[in-house]
């Protein structure tokens, strides 16, 4: 290929901009941020402003489809080669909103001139040692930086898996200094819990630097290593609520007191770990779902402590499940439901079987944590109730792969026990024939963690209906 | 198996091919459906001026030629070979050239081809002489260059720590070690042949002479795992690091009253991430390797390491899937009786 793909992509973009200029009268005449005379090292930031702008077809005439396709192509991510990203990234580039706003015609002209400038830069950088002796690019910037956080345990994940490169992560608050973590790692995740728990109400920003594996001192052509910024993250507002657990229930006459375990977090105060309630206070509420073991009709109650006191009918056994909620949030408001706990469980033998299956799964999860099993397993992550038996059989089959690959006696025994429990409960339903369900091999392959999470979800479906 | 042609990186998504080589998105002609003058020729050029970077790394190039009473069209696109296109499976997706095959479509003549070298759907070949069973290696864009899929990357080098230049026994400059360094943490590692440290902090040891150390302790209350850098000239926990030159961290029990205490040290990067308890691990003979692994029907394997305790995976060939409940894993293990290493038999079945 005479020209590299970065050039092809940039040239394509110029062609698309030119094509859109022909349809400028069919675009919504909205004023859009249009960077001009972009300062050096802020070209990629300006480029992303052009890509993010809400350029829209005015939905008139026959050109709507071609316009929409062109706009879609404009918004496709360019190849993030070092030639593109190996500029001195700065945190001080202007925000998109601060650029002058222009109607579509000028917007497109300015976009084109930025693209031309970037092509020129790219060509000149190729003659300035941006490639190593074998002709391959040194490093690629990290991308898809994602915060994964539950009950404040916070991990930054990114892509790609490194090929001849290593990463270092930095984190800071908006006003604070950068702190380096996970030095020169080949992992694509970094546990930043220690940093964010210092003040969970602060907003944090992280960045991932890429270095050539053979020489971490070597940097991009502008004298700094490539890096990519994460989205901002405010733990108090964004950490996911972990699955709650029912600690106990106690019946006195026609009242039952249900207590939710106060989950410990990794947030410290005066050298002690705070519970979820300590951190969130009255911002955290729990919703209790409860129903008679003999029926499916659910009732619900709420509390802003960790205790519920509910009325029940005498002589009836009830099942309980709780969900944590933070009403003041607009997203990530709810946790997943807790495992179901039932009164007098000997009466609901199959429900108890399923509850035991969940505890076996938790045991397997704990046991494999310290093993390196990289298998991917067929996983039904969105089980339709009419296919739950078929899906369960796939989960049980694939569980045997974990048993095989761990070579661990206690995992083997736990898996064997779990399969017996599950098969007992499945056979209690008689031979259910489900039609139109996916074969195991048609399912997506997921890593073990996701497989086990989905397994727990399907077991909960059985608990809720057994 | 030749490594998949490597292209410069599109960071949208990184996928690896059967050999574990990074598979970058394909460059294909992408003009969708256009009228064409291509007729009664052994081969045609697409006359499509748009080269597109396929959105997903697994996508290949496709060309569809159709002729009816009114006109001839040529369609050029990227498409995922796992999914049918125009109701047909892309059987030839791995081919480097786009060799047209006729498909049955009522009311029209319909040819389709797919291929996986850059812009390979620019030149579409109808000629029956073209030997599809043995396509030549040319055409498309050459893979060229070093670092093809199967080559084992060189050991990670580290930058010089200028505080102190140290050389090894051969006079070569010795760079500081990379080790897991989480100090003491609670652990779930128990009764296992080997464990991962679950320490996410990789540290560059302060001094070039330092090695990686792991300490596993169990008492009535809990289990801990300690990971650090340490200078082997100095004792650690009152014990000399006798195994500091070992590339792997092989645990040895030490006498400590009131607890079970294991310690190991090693001098390859992050070697204290994987701690090995298994006595079968033959420390006296670290050079034992496995022969090439056995073949499994409808599957390939690309071995990254033949050394003892390597774990490798077979991958089902295109059009086949791993049968649920079967494992693609094979492990290089030692037969104690013969002291010969062999690969374990995977339970893998590949089905259509």
């Amino acid at each position: 290929q005479g020209q590299d793909r970065h050039m092809i992509r940039m040239r394509q973009l110029i062609d698309i901009v030119d094509q859109l200029k022909n349809y400028v009268n069919d675009l919504v005449p909205e004023f859009l941020p249009a960077p001009e005379d972009v300062e050096t090292n802020c070209e990629w930031s300006a480029f992303s402003c052009f890509q993010k702008a809400q350029l829209k077809s005015a939905n008139t005439g026959n050109n709507e489809r071609i316009i929409n396709v062109s706009i879609k192509k404009l918004k496709r991510k360019p190849p993030s080669t070092n030639a593109g990203r190996r500029q001195k990234h700065r945190l001080t580039c202007p925000s998109c909103d601060s650029y002058e706003k222009k109607p579509p015609k000028e917007f497109l002209e300015r976009f084109k001139s930025l693209l031309q400038k970037m092509i020129h830069q790219h060509l000149s950088s190729r003659t300035h040692g941006s490639e190593d002796s074998s002709g391959t690019t040194n490093t690629v910037a990290a991308y898809n930086l994602t915060w994964k956080s539950t009950n404040f345990k916070t991990i930054l994940e990114w892509e790609p898996k490194p090929v001849n490169q290593v990463y270092t992560v930095q984190i800071s608050t908006k006003s604070g200094d950068w702190k380096s973590k996970c030095f020169y790692t080949t992992d694509t995740e970094c546990d930043l819990t220690d940093e964010i728990v210092k003040d969970v109400k602060q907003t944090y920003l992280a960045r991932v630097f890429s270095y050539p594996a053979g020489n971490v001192e070597s940097t991009g052509s502008a004298g700094e290593p490539l890096y990519e910024n994460s989205p901002e993250f405010t733990p108090y507002l964004e950490t996911n609520l972990g699955q709650p657990t029912i600690q106990s229930f106690e019946q006195v006459g026609t009242k039952v007191n249900v207590t939710v375990e106060d989950e410990r977090t990794l947030v410290r105060r005066n050298n002690t770990f705070l519970s979820l309630r300590d951190v969130f206070g009255k911002d955290l509420i729990y919703t209790l779902y409860y129903w008679k073991s003999s029926s499916s009709g659910k009732k619900t109650a709420k509390t802003n402590t960790n205790e519920f006191l509910i009325d029940v009918d005498k002589g009836e056994n009830y099942c309980f499940s709780v969900q944590a909620v933070i009403p003041s949030r607009t997203v990530n408001r709810k946790s997943t439901d807790s495992p179901v706990e039932c009164m007098g469980q000997e009466k609901g033998e199959f429900r108890e079987n399923w509850v035991n299956v969940i505890s076996d799964l938790k045991k397997i999860e704990d046991l494999i944590q310290s093993m390196h099993i990289d298998a991917t397993l067929y996983t039904e992550s969105d089980v339709h109730p009419s296919c739950k038996v078929t899906a369960m059989k796939c989960f049980l089959l694939e569980l045997q792969v974990i048993s095989l690959e761990s070579g661990d006696a206690s995992i083997h025994d736990t898996v064997e026990n779990l399969i017996i429990l599950a098969n007992n409960s499945l056979s209690s339903n008689g031979n259910v024939t489900e039609s139109g369900c996916k074969e195991c091999e048609e399912l997506e392959e997921k890593n073990i963690k996701e497989f086990l999470q989905s397994f727990v979800h399907i077991v909960q479906m059985f608990i809720n209906t057994s | 198996i030749p490594p998949h042609v490597q292209k410069s990186v599109n960071n949208d998504m990184i996928v690896t091919d059967n050999n574990g080589a990074v598979k970058f998105p394909q460059l294909c002609k992408f003009c969708d459906v256009r009228f064409s003058t291509c007729d009664n020729q052994k081969s045609c050029m697409s006359n499509c001026s748009i080269t597109s970077i396929c959105e997903k790394p697994q996508e290949v190039c496709v060309a569809v030629w159709r002729k009816n009473d009114e006109n001839i069209t040529l369609e050029t696109v990227c498409h995922d070979p796992k999914l049918p296109y125009h109701d047909f499976i892309l059987e030839d997706a791995a081919s480097p050239k786009c060799i047209m095959k006729e498909k049955k479509k009522p009311g029209e003549t319909f040819f389709m081809c797919s291929c996986s070298s850059d812009e390979c759907n620019d030149n579409i070949i109808f000629s029956e002489e073209y030997n599809t069973s043995n396509p030549d290696g040319g055409g498309g864009s050459g893979g060229g260059g070093s670092g093809g899929g199967g080559s084992i990357p060189p050991h990670v080098q580290k930058s010089v720590n200028n505080d102190m230049i140290v050389t090894d026994n051969n006079g070569a400059v010795k760079f500081p070690q990379l080790c897991k360094f989480c100090d003491v943490r609670f652990s779930t590692c128990d009764n296992q042949k080997s464990c991962m440290s679950n320490c996410s902090i990789t540290s560059i040891c302060e001094k070039p002479q330092e090695v990686c150390v792991a300490v596993w302790r169990k008492n009535d209350e809990n289990i801990t795992l300690e990971t650090v850098c340490h200078d082997p000239k100095l004792p650690y926990h009152d014990f000399i690091l006798e195994d500091a030159a070992s590339p792997k961290c092989i645990m040895k029990e030490k006498k400590k009253p009131g607890e079970t205490f294991f310690m190991c040290s090693c001098s390859s990067d992050e070697c204290n991430d994987n701690i090995i308890f298994s006595e079968e691990y033959n420390t006296s003979n670290p050079d034992i390797t496995c022969p090439p692994p056995m073949s499994v029907e409808h599957a390939d394997i690309w071995v990254k390491s033949y050394s003892l305790y390597s774990r490798e995976r077979y991958i089902c060939n295109s059009g086949f899937k791993r049968k649920a409940g079967t494992s693609s894993l094979t492990e290089c293990v030692l037969n104690k009786a013969t002291n010969v290493a062999h690969w374990t038999t995977p339970s893998l079945k590949c089905i259509r």
Epitope: T303, P327, T330, N332, D337 | -
Partner: antibody, heavy 117, light 107 residues
Framework: QIQLVQSGGEVKKPGASVRVSCKAS????????VYWVRQSPGKGLEWIGY????????IYDQNFKGKATLTVDKSTSTAYMELSSLRSEDTAVYFC??????????WGQGTTVTVSS | DIQMTQSPASLSASVGDRVTITCLAS??????LAWYLQKPGKSPQLLIY???NLADGVPSRFSGSGSGTDFSFTISSLQPEDFATYYC?????????FGQGTKLEIK
């Protein structure tokens, strides 16, 4: 901005069924329960039940069990209420509303269902 | 089930008056109570949540108080647009019952 838009009024014969829809926009649909409330002519508000789009759990008032069935389509952020075996006393305005756990902060415009032979 | 008894059922007042409506729960509901206003032919509108908190965009002349079983809702100085029907609702446990409503009319 946050909106709940309900389907138009319906006139049904006794014994028939009706499905009322409530399309949500401007917020994360699965993060909030959807409540259904009935108001008979000249009367007060009666709680029918709610559905949690996150986990599919439904809670009904005893008086509406077997009468109302609540469902959601997450892909279109739409909640549905089906009323079966309609009788003249089911003639009412039916509201959907968003539950913020401590109250119902946004309401649909209401759907009038008339049951008449 | 928890019964909510609202009083009075109707009330006549003049612009500028201070009016109070009460709501009594048949068992303790902590502060899980909301107040709504409804005008004829319109949907209800949230005024107060968690017994005492003013909803977004609601004028400060509206206030709520109480916890446990006894709750009250006050309009400190009636405005012409305040003449409507007011409802309390407990959101503590299902079924989430409403009071029967208080119709506020112009004297």
């Amino acid at each position: 901005q946050i909106q709940l838009v309900q389907s138009g009024g319906e006139v049904k014969k006794p014994g028939a069924s009706v499905r009322v829809s409530c399309k949500a926009s401007g917020y994360s649909f699965t993060d909030y329960n959807v409540y259904w409330v009935r108001q008979s002519p000249g009367k007060g508000l009666e709680w029918i039940g709610y559905i949690d789009p996150y986990n599919g759990i439904t809670i009904y008032d005893q008086n509406f069990k077997g009468k109302a069935t609540l469902t959601v389509d997450k892909s279109t952020s739409t909640a549905y209420m089906e009323l079966s075996s309609l009788r003249s006393e089911d003639t009412a305005v039916y509201f959907c509303a968003r539950d913020v756990t401590t109250a119902l902060d946004f309401w649909g415009q209401g759907t009038t269902v008339t049951v008449s032979s | 089930d928890i019964q909510m008894t609202q009083s009075p059922a109707s009330l006549s007042a003049s612009v500028g008056d201070r009016v109070t409506i009460t709501c009594l729960a048949s068992q303790t509901i902590d502060t899980w109570l909301a107040w709504y206003l409804q005008k004829p032919g319109k949907s209800p509108q949230l005024l107060i949540y968690a017994a005492t908190n003013l909803a977004d965009g609601v004028p400060s002349r509206f206030s709520g108080s109480g916890s446990g079983t006894d709750f009250s809702f006050t309009i400190s100085s009636l405005q012409p647009e305040d003449f409507a029907t007011y409802y309390c609702q407990q959101v503590y446990s299902s079924p989430f019952t409403f009071g029967q409503g208080t119709k506020l009319e112009i004297k």
